[in-house]
Amino acid sequence: MNSFNYTTPDYGHYDDKDTLDLNTPVDKTSNTLRVPDILALVIFAVVFLVGVLGNALVVWVTAFEAKRTINAIWFLNLAVADFLSCLALPILFTSIVQHHHWPFGGAACSILPSLILLNMYASILLLATISADRFLLVFKPIWCQNFRGAGLAWIACAVAWGLALLLTIPSFLYRVVREEYFPPKVLCGVDYSHDKRRERAVAIVRLVLGFLWPLLTLTICYTFILLRTWSRRATRSTKTLKVVVAVVASFFIFWLPYQVTGIMMSFLEPSSPTFLLLNKLDSLCVSFAYINCCINPIIYVVAGQGFQGRLRKSLPSLLRNVLTEESVVRESKSFTRSTVDTMAQKTQAV
């Protein structure tokens, strides 16, 4: 986003009228936070608590299964991406409480806010990988039987992480701390200064690669999968499919405000009223995007409870049931019952 996408508190007697009140003492530190910032703080607090505990639990559950169960590999990587992002929250929280003052230095300014973008790219690339996996299971069952293994899944995850890091670099490079003269404050943000074209390019790439292109491909992918599953009852794995669709849907819902405001700000002049309005909403948009970091464990638990019916289960076993269930394709025309059973035994060891 442009220049410095963090706003300062309003100073009632500062920069508003052309009059001097020589008896009014200057309030150099405002005590009031804006409503969007308060909402952002509430969201950050909830996301941190749910995200750290929930994702730690998902990591713990899936880590044991990741050697042999491919679904566990996918969900483990998603949880690690979310968990990493949650670790930056206390610092972002502190900064907002201090009216976006950044006392943590330049290195922290470059690294910590970039974690959420790393999470965005890692998540969407992992979701694309998972979706490709679901697609292949439905449409290329024989190929899956022969080649779908844990090794290939880990390679796919490594590629996703590598690409995510690569896509995060521009934001990382342009993040700087700026100390403002009045009100006295150190801010952390992106500064493209002379290069408006580069700023727009970064925003467009982020929107296209991190949002629009995945939205298009995943929509097409799941449309085909759902059509096949509904028409032929082709998979046993509707459970995982429902979970993945929910995760993908939440991803796009919660990233939407951030992406929209980001692209708008890159095309606006920093001094324009619209830019300043969007600027004020920036923390709220970031916090809304951060919901992605805690929503997945919630989806898993809700899905688990739905699948278990009234059966009471411990949280770890409930998660294990959702996250480590292997997908086995069942095509009545292509396979006999015994073939499917043999295949089921085989994939459990993958």
Epitope: S3, F4, Y6, T7, T8, H13, Y14, D15, D16, K17, D18, T19, L20, D21, L22, N23, T24, P25, V26, K28, H100, R178, E179, E180, Y181, F182, P184, K185, L187, G189, D191, Y192, S193, P270, S271, F275, L276, N279
Partner: antibody
Framework: QVQLVQSGAEVKKPGASVKISCKAS????????MNWVRQAPGKGLEWMGR????????KYNGKFKGRVTITADESTSTAYMELSSLRSEDSAVYFC??????????????WGQGTTVTVSS | DVVMTQSPLSLPVTLGQPASISCRSS???????????LHWFQQRPGQSPRLLIY???NRFSGVPDRFSGSGSGTDFTLKISRVEAEDVGVYYC?????????FGGGTKLEIK
């Protein structure tokens, strides 16, 4: 009207310290930042630091690496700037300049007449 | 630090003719509150600097209307519509958006 009256010219030896005063009148001294700016002969302007007399809060230009100390006395509406470990390149005209915080101007609007400091052995 | 680059260094102008001074900053001077704290000062020979224009385009009290400022982000301009004899001196652009406050190298306006 706003007036900033500075102390007279100083001649110092290298390694010594100099303390310049700036007496303010015509406005609420506590409601502004007092800045110190210097100008070497034939050169441009260089900001040294500021003080908020209301609470003594200061900010310095990192270039001066702890050599500069800015203080203020609210009772006499006077700001002071002390520069230690003087070297020949510190020979300059030193200005105090007000930055009024409670107006729409929010700029360094009024300047003192300047104090010439000569550092010579 | 924000580097302020002024051009030209010297500006010989005929009385009554317009004059224009350019100032470019190494970083955006847009403050997080939306304001741009770019100012112009005039320093007549042997005098202290005097504020002419504050926040890009606002004339300070007592400044003649022949002085005007414009620009945004990193590029700014001071214009004098008709130069008068009393306008001779050095003109500085300055920013008070970021710490430390910085000034341009100055532009010396002289009469041809």
């Amino acid at each position: 009207q706003v007036q900033l009256v500075q102390s007279g010219a100083e001649v110092k030896k290298p390694g010594a310290s100099v303390k310049i005063s700036c007496k303010a009148s015509g406005y609420a001294f506590s409601n502004s930042w007092m800045n110190w700016v210097r100008q070497a002969p034939g050169k441009g302007l260089e900001w040294m630091g500021r003080i908020y007399p209301g609470d003594g809060d200061t900010k310095y230009n990192g270039k001066f690496k702890g050599r500069v100390t800015i203080t203020a006395d609210e009772s006499t509406s006077t700001a002071y700037m002390e520069l230690s470990s003087l070297r020949s390149e510190d020979s300059a005209v030193y200005f105090c300049a007000r930055f009024l915080l409670i107006s729409t101007v929010t700029a360094v609007d009024y300047w003192g007449q300047g104090t010439t400091v000569t550092v010579s052995s | 630090d924000v580097v302020m680059t002024q051009s030209p260094l010297s500006l010989p102008v005929t009385l009554g003719q317009p004059a224009s001074i350019s100032c470019r900053s190494s970083q955006s001077l847009v403050h997080s509150n939306g304001n741009t704290y770019l100012h112009w000062f005039q320093q007549r020979p042997g005098q202290s600097p005097r504020l002419l224009i504050y926040k890009v385009s606002n004339r300070f009290s007592g400044v003649p209307d022949r002085f005007s400022g414009s620009g945004s982000g990193t590029d700014f301009t001071l214009k004098i519509s008709r130069v008068e004899a009393e306008d001779v001196g050095v003109y500085y652009c300055s920013q008070s958006t970021l710490v430390p406050l910085t000034f341009g190298g100055g532009t010396k306006l002289e009469i041809k």
